[in-house]
């Protein structure tokens, strides 16, 4: 039995991959910020989790993906006031009683210390410092990524 | 209420440097990205460039060369400096509150008349 | 970056009539990031819609956008006398952020 959050996930998920392929994203487009081979994107304004994935797929990108401690730290850098907490895209699943990221893969363990449960209706955030599992319906800001294509330099055999 | 206030010299002699600064109140600087836009006498609007709270800044590829975004969180300002200026750059200076792809530029200071004269 | 152009440059109706406003694009307007402001003489000019269609707070629903790509449009349906202003298409989408030239609507 998937819960509403994770069927809005899959939906969301499958309909980003039903689009047409865009060419590869060179550059980060205006308000982005690049950051190593991503560009992201910091709402102002507050939204429950699901709101959340909603908009940043209207942007044609995904709530922010975080691959390992190391990114984790790199975009805690960007965030400068202390206060202020950021949705990505991890979510509980009920179903598999594990953090699941909204590409479908499991959270590893040793990736994030989340403070706070890992439970029914239950996000996880970001600040400054931290990470927080927080209740879905929540409402604070949030973090887009769109992956830049890595431009290839062309290697020409000696003249 | 979002209030911006315009605050600098009203006249510029050319090939100096241009300072204007921006003070907002109403809302925290800490978000949104801050921008400047200047129109000429008579003439239509031009983007300068924005700056994100945490430094991060985007200037129009026309004025790159010469211009210089900066924020202070604490004073909840920001500010431009425009260099080596001309008689071209003669204009009223707009700061504005933009909040990128969500809503453009919601918020924006009356306006201060630079002129470039010698 | 992208020309925005206004047309026409200037349009002359009475209060009570539906003024039509063009905005054309040089490229395809990003996820129809553009904006519309009015600006009158001596003040700094207001929002009134963006993403090519939402009003932005407090502006009264006779102002109305729409179209996508590269054309676009601002409606407002029955002139105020306080709506005789210079109207601004700006797009938001694409780096440098650009205006159109501006259209002014005054009173025939």
């Known amino acids: 039995q998937k819960s509403s959050i994770e069927k809005c996930s899959v939906d969301i998920q499958q309909s980003r991959n039903k689009t047409t392929e865009r060419p590869g994203l060179l550059n980060c487009p205006i308000y982005w910020q690049q950051l190593r081979e991503k560009c992201l994107l910091f709402s102002h304004t507050v939204n429950p989790w699901n709101n959340s994935l909603a908009d940043c797929s209207t942007k044609e990108s995904s709530l922010l993906l975080i691959r390992d401690k190391d990114e984790l730290i790199h975009t805690q850098n960007l965030i400068r006031d202390k206060a202020i907490l950021f949705w990505i895209g991890l979510n509980f699943s009920l179903s598999e009683k594990n953090w699941k990221w909204i590409n479908g893969s499991f959270l590893n363990s040793n990736d994030l210390e989340i403070r706070g449960d890992a439970k029914e209706n239950s996000c996880i955030s970001i600040s400054q410092t931290s990470v927080y599992s927080e209740y879905c319906s929540t409402e604070i800001r949030w973090i887009c990524q769109k992956e830049l294509t890595p431009v290839r330099n062309k290697v020409y055999p000696d003249s | 209420q979002v209030q911006l206030q315009e605050s600098g010299p009203g006249l510029v002699q050319p090939s100096e440097t241009l300072s204007l600064t921006c003070t907002v109140s109403g809302s925290s600087i800490s978000s949104y990205y801050w921008s400047w836009i200047r129109q000429p006498p008579g003439k239509g609007l031009e983007w300068i460039g924005y700056i994100y709270y945490n430094g991060n800044t985007n200037y129009n590829p026309s004025l790159k060369s010469r211009v210089t975004l900066s924020v202070d969180t604490s004073k909840n300002q920001f500010s431009l400096k425009v260099r080596s200026v001309t008689a071209a750059d003669t204009a009223v200076y707009y700061c504005?509150?933009?909040?990128?792809?969500?809503?453009?530029?919601?918020?924006w200071g009356q306006g201060t008349l630079v002129t470039v004269s010698s | 970056e992208i020309v925005l152009t206004q047309s026409p440059g200037t349009l002359s109706l009475s209060p009570g009539e539906r003024a039509t406003l063009s905005c054309r694009a040089s490229q395809s307007v990003s996820s129809s990031y553009l904006a519309w402001y009015q600006q009158k003489p001596g003040q700094a000019p207001r929002l009134l819609i963006y993403?090519?269609?939402s009003r932005a707070t407090g502006i009264p629903d006779r102002f109305s956008g729409s179209g996508s790509g590269t054309d676009f449009t601002l409606t407002i349906s029955r002139l105020e006398p306080e709506d005789f202003a210079v109207y601004y298409c700006?797009?938001?989408?694409?780096?440098?952020?650009?205006f159109g030239q501006g259209t002014k609507v005054e009173i025939k």
């Open positions: 504005a509150r933009d909040s990128g792809p969500w809503v453009p530029l919601d918020y």
């Open positions: 700006q797009q938001y989408g694409s780096s440098p952020p650009t």
């Open positions: 993403g090519a269609s």
